[in-house]
């Protein structure tokens, strides 16, 4: 007996298109052996017509399609444009076609339904709008013209010229009389319904001499695009709804259990708590289409997806629809780094942000997910020298460890970081990654002053004590600027007194800076490291001044000044909004945008999004 | 909601036929998949074929013990599905439930289905 399964029998109709999916024992051979799907001859024989290696006979050119879903055991053999010809005996399978490993799939295609002569058919999607077009002779043009549909044996007023609309039609059907020139009136139903489909006869005139023409019409309720992603990565839904919407709200909802479809998020304002963070709803276009990015998937977000357009932004009868099944790919190559990471007022983070190996060259960003109306990530901080502004000296991107991972470091924290931020590049959109920075009690590790003033030709030594923990970190002084930071050298001062209970192992590490100048002035940071993996920072401002008397400045942490006033926002800046944020190759024409403000920065409430991947600021 | 009656079940020798009908009502606009399982005394519920369709197009999936035997249909307009067994079998014999679904992944999967009816008995003298 064959592992294959899948359905023993298809019927389906001229003109249609059939999905047709394959189960098989998910064992790691079968995952990666040959898929295919061959008809049988009459001889025995079966003739491949699609395979997963990429073969497509001609007889399904453009028109078929076969895709692999190792992680679930399946593969879908996609045929459009089905006519007659295409009926007969298959068989899906793996491996090579006469061995076995195969299941008989009986596909019948008719011509359609039983349909009365001159029949016009109408084949339209689920939610949108159909015109039935009904002609008429001159000696019934005053007359009454009605629209009926054939429930059973009996005929059933639909609507018709003199008012009456059937109450199942309330509020989405009309019926238009064309100009004195035009012999035909028509019938628009709007926001169809799955029970819409059947049979109607329109008719203009009531006696023996009405004109009458019949017409099919079938409701298609949307196959589901499926979607494969890797856990961690992201997936983005284009949903194009058509122009006809462009004005109403918009959603994407998740089929839960039964008739449910719980909102994910919505051009309302509504978004679901379990995708706080890690959800845009891009701008829509003029013709009503629009875009969902999730990022940071998790295997409970595997599903059937719906994109829709209804006033109250949520799933109704009639709403257009565009439907996916997305499965999350466990077998993931996108790496595991921490979703929380946690750090205390003052001190610092140091968060590492995957990305696809394959493209160490792509220009890496690092961006802050804003969840006003729909979500927003303005762009802080790029690969290629662009801060924005008021993160200047506290905010670096760094290409280290390399290999896959960026590391990205914020300091002199506040409440107002926490927050939701997403790593990504303007190489493979899958590669976004989202990790929440949550701002907890404490005190920061290493001390060192507040601001610190240098004069120029002297010399300054500026302190920075390290704590016991880091007795086997690297410690570095380095001068921010916006490319990084570049290593100086630095003197071992021996043990701290900075902090209690602390052993020998503390250490005062010092930057000293001979005949100081004026291009010294700016941000400096001490930090620890291990290898190419960078622990906590703290950051001093030096400012120089002219000479006012002789001498070297030593700064003690008692003599340090109060740390500096917070930047005004800066006109020089960028903010890069959602639609960038689809297609990161935007972000290069972003750059010259001048003279924009950002919203002033309000608080943010952090959301735990319940990981158990946290890291905190010290650690990696 | 959607409500799923079983009717049709019975007592029959072996090597008669049956038909079994499940009847849908409520928000059944959605559903995308009608199936029977069935369920023997002391042993698990077991799939025995479903008819999943989009637009006209149905696909009627079944069990390997029940191929050539059992066939699966449904009625659009009625929201009904039927089975029909023919040459039935003692190890036939157990309750047949009726379920339906919104989403299906797996057909095979009871866990795939959202609503289920009260079953029917059937049972299969020799």
């Known amino acids: 007996k064959s592992p294959i399964f899948g359905p023993e029998e298809v019927n389906s109709v001229e003109g249609n298109s059939v999905s047709i999916t394959c189960y098989y024992p998910p064992t790691s051979v079968n995952r990666h052996t040959r898929k295919y799907w061959c008809r049988q001859g009459a001889r025995g024989g079966c003739i491949t017509l699609i395979s997963s290696e990429g073969y497509v006979s001609s007889k399904y050119a453009g028109r078929a399609n076969l895709t692999n879903f190792p992680e679930n055991g399946t593969f879908v053999v996609n045929i459009a444009q089905l006519s007659q010809d295409d009926s007969g005996r298959y068989k899906c399978g793996l491996g090579i076609n006469s061995r076995g490993l195969s299941f008989d799939v009986s596909l019948e295609v008719s011509q359609g339904p039983g349909l009365l002569n001159d029949t016009k058919v109408y084949t339209v999607d689920l939610g949108r709008t159909v015109t039935i077009n009904c002609p008429f002779k001159t000696e019934n043009a005053q007359k009454r013209k009605s629209l009926y549909k054939q429930i059973g044996l009996y005929p059933v007023l639909v609507i018709d010229s003199s008012g009456y609309v059937n109450p199942n039609y309330t509020g989405r059907i009309r019926l238009d009389i064309q100009g004195t020139g035009q012999l035909l009136f028509s019938v628009v139903i709007n926001q169809l319904r799955l029970s819409d489909a059947g049979q109607y006869l329109c008719q203009a005139g009531d006696d023996s001499n009405s004109n009458k023409k019949n017409a099919d019409l079938q409701v298609l309720k949307p196959e589901p695009e499926l979607v494969y992603e890797d856990l961690r990565g992201s997936v983005t839904f284009h949903c194009a709804l058509g122009p006809e919407v462009a004005n109403v709200a918009k959603f994407l909802c998740r089929q839960s259990s039964g008739e449910n479809c719980d909102v994910v998020v919505n051009t309302l304002g509504k978004r679901a708590p379990a995708f706080e963070g890690r959800i845009l709803l891009n701008p829509q276009d003029k013709d009503g289409s629009f875009s969902v990015v999730i990022t940071g998937l998790r295997k409970e977000d595997a599903g059937r997806y719906l994109c829709g357009a209804h006033s109250d932004g949520q799933l109704q009868e009639g709403s257009p629809i565009q439907a996916w099944q997305l499965f999350v790919n466990e077998e993931s190559t996108i790496p595991r780094s921490p979703t929380v990471v946690k750090g205390v007022a003052g001190g610092s983070v140091a968060v590492l942000c995957p990305y696809n190996r394959k493209e160490s060259k792509s220009i890496k960003y690092w961006c802050l997910w804003e969840g006003a109306q729909n979500g927003r990530c303005p762009l802080l901080v790029d690969s290629e020298g662009w801060v924005k502004a008021q993160y200047e000296g506290r905010l670096s991107l760094l290409e280290e460890p390399g290999n896959g991972t960026f590391t990205v470091i914020l300091n002199q924290l506040t409440s107002r970081d926490a927050g939701f931020y997403w790593c990504l590049t303007n190489g493979d959109t899958l590669w976004r990654t989202t990790v929440e920075i949550k701002i907890i009690e404490g005190e920061p590790n290493l001390k060192v002053p507040g601001n610190v003033t240098a004069v120029l030709g002297e010399t300054l030594k500026v302190p920075c004590h390290f704590p016991c923990k880091f007795s086997s970190y690297e410690k570095y002084w380095c001068k921010w600027n916006n490319t990084g930071c570049q290593a100086l050298p630095s003197q071992d001062e021996g043990p701290s007194k900075a902090f209690v209970n602390c052993d020998e192992n503390s250490r005062l590490v010092s930057l000293t800076l001979n005949l100081v100048t004026r291009a010294d002035e700016g941000w400096y940071w001490c930090g620890v490291k291990q290898g190419h993996f960078y622990g906590e920072t703290a950051a001093v401002y030096v400012a120089v001044e002219e000479r006012k008397a002789a001498g070297s400045r030593d700064v003690s942490l008692a003599k340090a000044d109060a740390a500096p006033d917070e930047k005004v926002l800066d006109s020089g800046f960028r903010e890069i909004e959602n639609k960038a944020i689809q297609d990161p190759r935007l972000f290069a024409e972003e750059k010259a945008v001048a003279d924009t403000r950002d919203q002033a920065d309000g608080s943010r409430a952090s959301v735990d999004s319940g990981s158990s991947e946290e890291q905190g600021g010290s650690s990696r | 909601e959607v409500q799923l009656v079983e009717s049709g079940g019975g007592l029959v020798q072996a090597g008669d036929s049956l038909r079994l009908s499940c009847a849908a009502s409520?928000?059944?606009?959605?559903?995308?998949?009608m199936g029977w399982f069935r369920q023997a005394p002391g042993k698990e519920r077991e799939f025995v074929t479903t008819?999943?369709?989009?637009?006209?197009?149905?696909?009627?999936y079944y069990a390997d013990s029940v191929k050539g035997r059992f066939t699966i249909s449904r009625d659009n307009a009625k929201n009904t599905a039927y089975l029909q067994m023919n040459s039935l079998k003692p190890d036939d014999t157990a309750v047949y439930y009726c379920?339906?679904?919104?989403?299906?992944?797996?057909?095979?999967?009871?866990?795939?289905?959202?609503?289920w009816g009260q079953g029917t008995q059937v049972t299969v003298s020799s």
């Open positions: 409520g928000r059944t606009r959605t559903t995308y998949g």
């Open positions: 008819i999943t369709w989009s637009g006209p197009t149905n696909y009627k």
């Open positions: 379920a339906a679904s919104t989403v299906l992944t797996d057909p095979r999967v009871p866990t795939e289905y959202d609503y």
